[in-house]
Interface confidence: low
């Protein structure tokens, strides 16, 4: 019986962009301004998200889809659907509770977000350091000294530096 009743539910005929208005004998009414319904058969429309303050509008709200926000310059999105904006730092820094701080020696950050990560340990791969690391850049590993025959130059392209904890594909 429940299944039959749901098939006859007049609300199921209400398309996205409308809601089933119980106050008007279950007529499909358009979503009011600044609200939306992304699926058919909704009994309410959701209020459109407002991109205020540090948020800015990436996509306007429509009757069938919510607004989408991103962050104003100097900030970046965090969380699903850009639920938060976090302050950018400079390359070579990470964001702490006390603000942007330089990466400690032996670590780097090549982005404006995220944390400082340890330099690659070339010796773990039996390689030597070709280019020293900085706060902004990882070290570049080169061939191990044993790989170089006498007189050979070390202009061979270095192996690409990889993120710590990631194995080669």
């Amino acid at each position: 019986f429940e299944r039959t009743r749901s098939l006859q539910d007049p609300c199921s005929n209400c398309p996205a962009g409308t809601f089933c208005d119980n106050n008007r004998n279950q007529i499909c009414s358009p979503c009011p301004p600044n609200s939306f319904s992304s699926a058919g058969g909704q009994r309410t429309c959701d209020i459109c998200r407002q991109c205020k303050g540090v948020f800015r509008t990436r996509k306007e709200c429509s009757s069938t889809s919510n607004a989408e926000c991103d962050c104003t310059p100097g900030f970046h999105c965090l969380g699903a659907g850009c639920s938060m904006c976090e302050q950018d730092c400079k390359q070579g820094q990470e964001l702490t509770k006390k603000g942007c701080k330089d990466c400690c020696f032996g670590t780097f950050n090549d982005q404006k977000r995220g944390i400082c990560r340890p330099w690659t340990n070339c010796s773990l791969d039996g390689k030597s350091v070709l280019v020293n690391g900085t706060k902004e850049r990882d070290v570049v590993c080169g061939p191990s000294p044993a790989d170089l025959s006498p007189g050979a130059s070390s202009v061979t392209p270095p192996a690409p530096a990889r993120e710590p904890g990631h194995s080669p594909q």
Partner: nanobody
């Protein structure tokens, strides 16, 4: 009083299956969208899947598409999550949540949900 109670968690081997249930009481279950979230140790709570009040619209996080299926039985006031081809990275406490009638947030964010269950632990290990 609104209550949500999850069950069905447990330990399973990679590639195995589990079916989680969320029993709701104290409110008109059939009038609200519902969702599953999960939280792995040391990580933020993560959206898994959401189902509209009438089952007409579903949404999944990319990593579970094709493996997890959300469903609901409105007469029984119960939400389900069928999980198959489970992986180690699916290990987490799984929560069901009730969608607010109105929300200014994306449906994948926890702020969109007003009532939460206590969670059920899913462990995937060989």
């Amino acid at each position: 009083e609104v209550q949500l109670l999850e069950s069905g968690g447990g330990e399973v081997q990679p590639g195995g299956s589990l079916r989680l249930s969320c029993a709701a009481s104290g409110w008109a279950f059939g009038n609200y969208g519902m969702a599953w979230f999960r939280q792995a140790p040391g990580k933020e709570r993560e959206f898994v899947s959401r189902l509209a009040w009438n089952g007409g619209s579903t949404d999944y996080v990319e990593s579970v598409k094709g493996r997890f299926t959300i469903s609901r039985d409105n007469p029984k006031n119960t939400l389900y999550l069928q999980m198959s081809s489970l992986r180690a990275e699916d290990t987490a406490v799984y929560y069901c949540a009730r969608q607010r009638s109105y929300s200014r947030y994306d449906i994948r964010t926890p702020q969109t949900y007003d009532y939460w269950g206590q969670g059920t632990l899913v462990t995937v290990k060989p």
